[in-house]
Amino acid sequence: VLPIDHVYGTLGIVGATTTQRYSDASKLREEIEGKGSFTYFAPSNEAWDNLDSDIRRGLESNVNVELLNALHSHMINKRMLTKDLKNGMIIPSMYNNLGLFINHYPNGVVTVNCARIIHGNQIATNGVVHVIDRVLTQIGTSIQDFIEAEDDLSSFRAAAITSDILEALGRDGHFTLFAPTNEAFEKLPRGVLERIMGDKVASEALMKYHILNTLQCSESIMGGAVFETLEGNTIEIGCDGDSITVNGIKMVNKKDIVTNNGVIHLIDQVLIPDSAKQVIELAGKQQTTFTDLVAQLGLASALRPDGEYTLLAPVNNAFSDDTLSMDQRLLKLILQNHILKVKVGLNELYNGQILETIGGKQLRVFVYRTAVCIENSCMEKGSKQGRNGAIHIFREIIKPA
C-alpha cells in the first residue's frame, strides 16, 4: 500500500512529475502542502508534452501569474472522488470560479472539460489527485464567441446568423456542436446550398442538425451511439480507430474544443437532415433506377421545391429489362403513377384511402396487419419525410386498377 501524503507529494506518487514541478515553480506548492482540502486534476507528463509549445512557453515564462492561474484552473477547493463527480455537474475551479464541466458516462469514463481521468482517486491527506490525459485550457468563451472568432467557420457563422441560431449558442447550456468548416461548405453542390440558404425552414433545420443538447466529449464515444439533435432527428456518433465518425463517415478533424457552454468538434462535411432535403434527394441506393428515370424523363422538374409530393419509389430490382426497354412515353406514364400530388406520411395512410397521382390516376391503399400496400405493391421499411414531400419504398412497380 502506498503511503498517504499531501497533494503535492501525491503528484509525485502518481507520476505527474511535470505538474509537481510546475506547482513548485509557481509557488502553488505551499498551498497544496498546507491546510485545506483540494481536488487536483493533474495533467500527466505526456499531457504536458502534447500541449501546444507556444502555450507551454507562455506559461513557463510567467510562472507567478499565468502558470499559477492555469494550475488553479485544474483545482477544486474540496475533495471530490470520481463517485462524487456526477454527469452534468459544473464545478467552480480555483481560478476565477471558471466552470469545470463534469461528464460521467455510462461506460464509466469520467471527463473534466473533455480531459479523461486516466488514474483517479489517489487520496491525499488534504485532498485527492486525479490524473488527466490533457492540459485544460482556459475557457472564458462561449460556443458563439468561438464561432465569431474563427475565420475557418465564417460560412457556418453566416449560415447560423441567417437561420437565427448563433445567439442560442451564446446562452448557458451543455451543447455539443459539430461545426462544419468552410471547406465542408465548399463540398456541397452549389445548387443545394443556394436552395437551402433561401429557405428559412430548411436552413434552420440544417443548423440545428449540427447541435446536441448534451455534452459529448470524444473520450466518451465508444460504439455507434445515437443522439437526438436540436433539429429533432438523430445522428450516430462512433469511432474508427482514433477518428470520430458521424453517421458512419470519418469527418471530425479537430475534436474537444471546450467552451463555457459546451464542446465543439470541427467537421469537414455538412450534415444535411432529411427535413432540409428535396423529396428526390431522400431516395437511397436501392431506388437509383427510379430516380434516374425520373430525371431522364423530365419528371424531376415537375417536383418544384415550393410544391409538396410523395414518391412511391420501387426498389431497383422491381424494374425488369422489359420495363426499361419500353417506349419512353409509356415509361413516363408508369413513373407518373408513382408520384402523388400531395405529401402523405406513413402515419397518414389508411385502408380504403384513394390517392391521386400527378398523372391523374387514382390509387387505392390497403392496410394489413403486417403490411401497407398501394394497389398490387407493398411497402418496405425506409419511409422518409423531406422538406417538400415524403418517400415510401415499394417492392414492385405499382399497377393502377
Epitope: 475565420d151 475557418d152 465564417s154 460560412s155 457556418f156 453566416a158 449560415a159 441567417t162 468552410n182 471547406e183 461548405f185 465548399e186 456541397l188 452549389r190 445548387g191 446550398l193 443556394e194 436552395r195 440558404m197 433561401g198 429557405d199 436552413s203 422538374s301 418544384r304 421545391p305 415550393d306
Partner: antibody, heavy 118, light 110 residues
Framework: QVQLVQSGAEVKKPGASVKVSCKAS????????ISWVRQAPGQGLEWMGW????????NYAQKLQGRVTMTTDTSTSTAYMELRSLRSDDTAVYYC???????????WGQGTLVTVSS | QSVLTQSSSASGTPGQTVTVSCSGS????????VNWYQQLPGTAPKLLIY???QRPSGVPDRFSGSKSGTSASLAISGLQSADEADYYC???????????FGSGTKVTVL
Amino acid sequence: QVQLVQSGAEVKKPGASVKVSCKASGYTFTSYGISWVRQAPGQGLEWMGWISAYNGNTNYAQKLQGRVTMTTDTSTSTAYMELRSLRSDDTAVYYCARDMLVVPFDYWGQGTLVTVSS
Amino acid sequence: QSVLTQSSSASGTPGQTVTVSCSGSSSDIGSNRVNWYQQLPGTAPKLLIYSNDQRPSGVPDRFSGSKSGTSASLAISGLQSADEADYYCAAWDDSLSTYVFGSGTKVTVL
C-alpha cells in the same frame, strides 16, 4: 480590412489569351473561394465561375467551359483567371469577388478592363 | 439575354420608397435564394442583400429584400441621392448549373 486588388487593363487580339490576377489581403485566403464575374460595356453582370482557394476545386459556367481556367497561388494569396481563344464579345471589365458560398460575392476587386480588338 | 427579368429603370424623390422587382422561373428564383447587388457609377458591384432578406453588416436597414414564388423585390426606403445606382438581382439556376444575374435596374433620384 478585406481588399482584392486586380492587375491592370489589357488589350488583346482575337484568338489570344489573357490572364488576370487578383491579390487578396485582410483575411485568410484559403478560408474562402473566389468567383469571377464580367461586365461587357454598358451591359449587365455575367458569372464566369468559382475556385476554392482551399483545394483548387473549380466550378465554371457552362458557356465558358473549355476556354476558362481559374487557379490560385496560396503563397501569395492570389487568384488568377485565364481566358483563351478571345473574341470581340469577350471585351469586358473582369471582376474577382470573394465568395464564401453562404454569403456570395461579399467583397469585389476594382475590375480589370480587357479589350479584344484586331 | 439575362435569365432574370428586371424593369430597366425606377425613380423617386428623396425620402420616397422605391421598389425594384426581379422575375425568374421555377429553376432559379422558384428553387433558390435571391441576392442583390448595387453598382454605383464607375465602381465595382457591392453585395446589398443575400439569402432573400439578409443584410450584410454595414448595409443600412433602408434596404430590404423579399421573395415570393418566382419573383423577388428590393425596397429602398428614405431614398437618398447616394442611392443612384444600378441594382442587380441574382440567383442560382438549377437547369443551367450557373449563377445568373438580372439585366439590372437603374434607380434615379429625382
